[in-house]
């Protein structure tokens, strides 16, 4: 018995075709990806197979003005136009709490929502019951799969699930309900979720009974043979995965952003056991044509998304300092008020020894693209955000030893002078550089603000600790010639759109006045 | 569809002056850092300037310092150069071109200028 | 600083792997450019950063290198990549290497 499995990750609000680098589309003969192409491809394997399921393996949410203005609604609606089988949490399903994912998508959705090891208490446990289930058994042509979700338990420090949902280490909670999926005579047993492409292995080798892993949030891209794009493999698809118990199990993840559609074809035996698999994931570029329909529909909802960008999100009354000969030469305000909003959104009390897990933000003052000029009326727009924001990047969580971090900060002022974006701008960081010392030595006092404390002081940089930082995922992955992140980062989480986190903080705060407060000095 | 279209070019004496001119459209102009780059004919590429996104920063190539100034308007989406005491030399093709080297890297068709009694 | 690239020319057959290099005067990190060259035609953006590929390029291409010296391989010449290629680093001011120009042979 063959089965087609179909599966998406990490589509991340990108519901309209994007640019070969998931930004916003710009040359519309060579985009890719999107809802309305998606739906054509699906649809063609659909007619031409017969067992076919659709998948997706979580991160929906966040990532464009999309997700910000319908707040998960465009989730729903789409992915029940599009006939998905099934959809497993992934952590940024809970960044509007846990309001924000009843109300728009699990009471929305036509497909089952899963996950195994996010278990409820208290008040929400009866409120939340059955809209989200640890497994979902799928009747395909005479067969039928077992589906079981998971979700990382990391999420209490990458998201907003609040304190009524508690996350288990995967492994143990999955093993449980396959067993119980067994014991309902289910030999066909898919692990879609959302904890990255180490745990998926470590899924697919430890967990008795799953056939099949379809993971997330790692975005990761495995291809056999030459990859069509420009996304390099981790791997061949599917990656083999030999068991504790000797069976082969294969695992799959689709990349990121809608540009792909994973395609993977499993053959089983009458017993349910695996007999081979292969596939690769589809490019969706502009030689599949978008669905007309799902397009209409798409540019029905796309009026809303307009009619926000000129709405006010707060007022400043300062100058908001995004000038080039500011922030790539100095502290500047715009800077500290980013970085304020990016450990804003990542306040997370998760334990009493902490005032929070992340005190630490670090920002290129080239990504700073445009000043505000508080004599609009103090007016800020999504607009405004937009051009001091334009590249469509996120503000990501990163572990990092601080001998990274002071390589870093050399980095930052290696070239002093030139106007180049290298320069960083801070939060929870206090930093003084000497410019008369050589390149790679300029650095003369690192103070970083503490975490474990009850009181948040400023205390020396040590080089051995791991420290937690807030940072764009441009420079996550190395860019502005920070090699020595990519390089040495331990973890690396993707985080919420930018232009996101700017308007939350500013329709929080409502009025804003940032000043230059002596983060960055010269000796 | 992202545009850069240049115009302005032309024949002029020696001594003479010529502004040229970038239309942008497609993207979001004032966010980007735009360049002046220029090709002698059959010669190779000769970067002459750059200016920051919100015009606060320039620089030039020693060719041209003191003679050449870019500027920007980026209510109109346009990108300037004013050439001063034109050489036989600064004859070429001139290109203005987002930043260089970066993700979002394009480039106009040129525009000749000719320098020449 | 100062980009010299060499060869300055190159005579090479489709299918054939093809090497430029491009070698820094003094040390520029991976501030690294590479751009493709048609007769009457802007530049194309290939490579930044010394080895990453810009959207839309063909994965035959691939840059490497850090420091003073670069190079920019081409691993199976197709017809349409006989063109000028030029190097050009933004370690400071922009400066272009004088390019290599690749004909068939």
């Known amino acids: 018995w063959e089965l087609t499995i179909l599966h998406t990750n990490d589509v991340h609000s990108r519901l309209e075709q994007t640019s070969e680098d998931s930004s916003k589309c710009v040359n519309a003969s060579r985009c890719m990806g999107g809802v309305a192409r998606l739906f054509t491809k699906v649809q063609q394997i659909r007619r031409a197979e017969p067992n076919v399921l659709l998948l997706d393996a979580g991160d929906q949410y966040q990532g464009t003005i999309w997700f910000t203005v319908y707040k998960g609604a465009e989730v729903a609606h789409f992915m029940n136009a599009l006939r998905y089988d099934a959809m497993a949490l992934g952590n940024h399903e809970f960044d509007n709490g846990v309001e924000g994912l009843i109300e728009p998508l699990l009471k929305e959705a036509k497909f089952p929502i899963l996950s195994a090891n996010i278990k409820a208490k208290g008040p929400l446990a009866s409120q939340i019951s059955g809209l989200y289930l640890p497994y979902k058994v799928l009747p395909v042509g005479d067969e039928v799969v077992g589906i079981v979700g998971y979700t990382s338990k990391e999420t209490p420090f990458l998201s907003n699930p609040g304190t009524n949902l508690v996350f288990e280490d995967e492994i143990t909670a999955l093993q449980p309900e396959v067993d119980k999926l067994k014991t309902l005579n289910v030999n066909k047993i898919i692990a879609l979720g959302h904890s990255g492409f180490e745990m998926d292995k470590l899924i697919a080798q430890k967990v008795r009974g799953v056939d099949v892993v379809v993971g997330g949030h790692s975005n990761t891209f495995l291809y056999t043979g030459n990859p069509p794009s420009k996304e390099v493999p981790a791997g061949k698809y599917p990656f083999i995965v030999t068991s504790d118990d000797g069976r082969k199990v294969p695992v799959v993840q689709a990349y990121a952003f809608g540009k792909y559609l994973g395609y993977l074809k499993i053959e089983f035996d009458e017993r349910g056991n695996v007999i081979s698999s292969h596939g690769n994931p589809i490019l969706l570029n502009s030689s599949i044509p978008e669905d007309p329909s799902i397009k209409a529909d798409i540019n029905k909802w796309r009026i809303k998304l307009d009619n926000y960008s000129t709405q006010e999100l707060g007022k400043t009354i300062v100058y908001l300092d995004g000038s080039s000969q500011s922030c790539r030469f100095r502290e500047c305000n715009m800077g500290n008020l980013i970085c304020d909003a990016m450990i804003n959104n990542n306040l997370r009390h998760t334990d009493e020894m902490f005032w929070n897990h992340v005190s630490m933000c670090i920002l290129n003052g080239g990504g700073i693209r445009s000043p505000i000029d508080e004599r609009n009326n103090g007016t800020i727009t999504w607009e405004n955000l937009a051009a001091v924001l334009p590249f469509g990047g996120t503000f990501d969580l990163v572990q990092l030893k601080g001998s990274t971090l002071k390589k870093a900060f050399e980095h930052s002022v290696h070239r002093y002078g030139q106007s180049t974006g290298e320069f960083l701008q801070v939060g929870g960081i206090h930093v003084v550089y000497d410019l008369s010392r050589k390149p790679g030595d300029r650095v003369v006092k690192l103070d970083v603000l503490c975490t474990k404390c009850r009181v948040p002081s400023y205390d020396p940089l040590k080089m051995d600790e791991v420290y937690k930082v807030i940072l764009p995922n441009f420079l996550a992955n190395g860019g502005d010639g920070f090699q020595m992140i990519k390089d040495e980062l331990l973890r690396h989480d993707s985080g919420d759109q930018d232009i996101n986190v700017v308007s939350t903080y500013i329709s929080k705060m409502k009025v804003i006045y940032p000043a230059v407060e002596g983060r960055i000095k010269f000796s | 569809e992202v545009q850069l279209v240049e115009s302005g070019g032309g024949l002029v004496q020696p001594g003479g002056s010529l502004r040229l001119s970038c239309a942008a459209s497609?993207?979001?102009?004032?966010?980007?850092?735009m360049h002046w780059v220029r090709q002698a004919p059959g010669k190779g590429l000769e970067w002459v300037a750059v200016m920051s996104y919100e015009g606060s920063n320039k620089y030039y190539a020693d060719s041209v310092k003191g003679r050449f100034t870019i500027s920007r308007d980026n209510s109109k989406n346009a990108l300037y150069l004013q050439m001063n005491s034109l050489r036989a030399e600064d004859t070429a093709v001139y290109y203005c071109?987002?930043?260089?080297?970066?993700?979002?890297?394009?480039w106009g068709q040129g525009t000749l200028v000719t320098v020449s009694s | 600083i100062q980009m010299t690239q060499s060869p300055s020319s190159l005579s090479a057959s489709v299918g054939d792997r093809v090497t430029i290099t491009c070698r820094a005067s003094?040390?520029?990190?991976?501030?690294l450019a590479w751009y493709q060259q048609k007769p009457g035609k802007a530049p194309k953006l290939l490579i930044y950063?010394?080895?990453t590929l810009q959207s839309g390029v063909p994965s035959r291409f691939s840059g490497s290198g850090s420091g003073t010296d670069f190079t920019l391989t081409i691993s199976s010449l197709q017809p349409e990549d006989f063109a000028t290629y030029y190097c050009q680093q933004s370690y400071s001011t922009p400066h272009f290497g004088q390019g290599t120009r690749l004909e068939i042979k």
């Open positions: 950063a010394a080895s």
């Open positions: 071109a987002t930043e260089i080297a970066a993700k979002g890297d394009y």
């Open positions: 003094q040390g520029i990190s991976n501030y």
């Open positions: 497609g993207f979001t102009f004032s966010s980007y850092d």
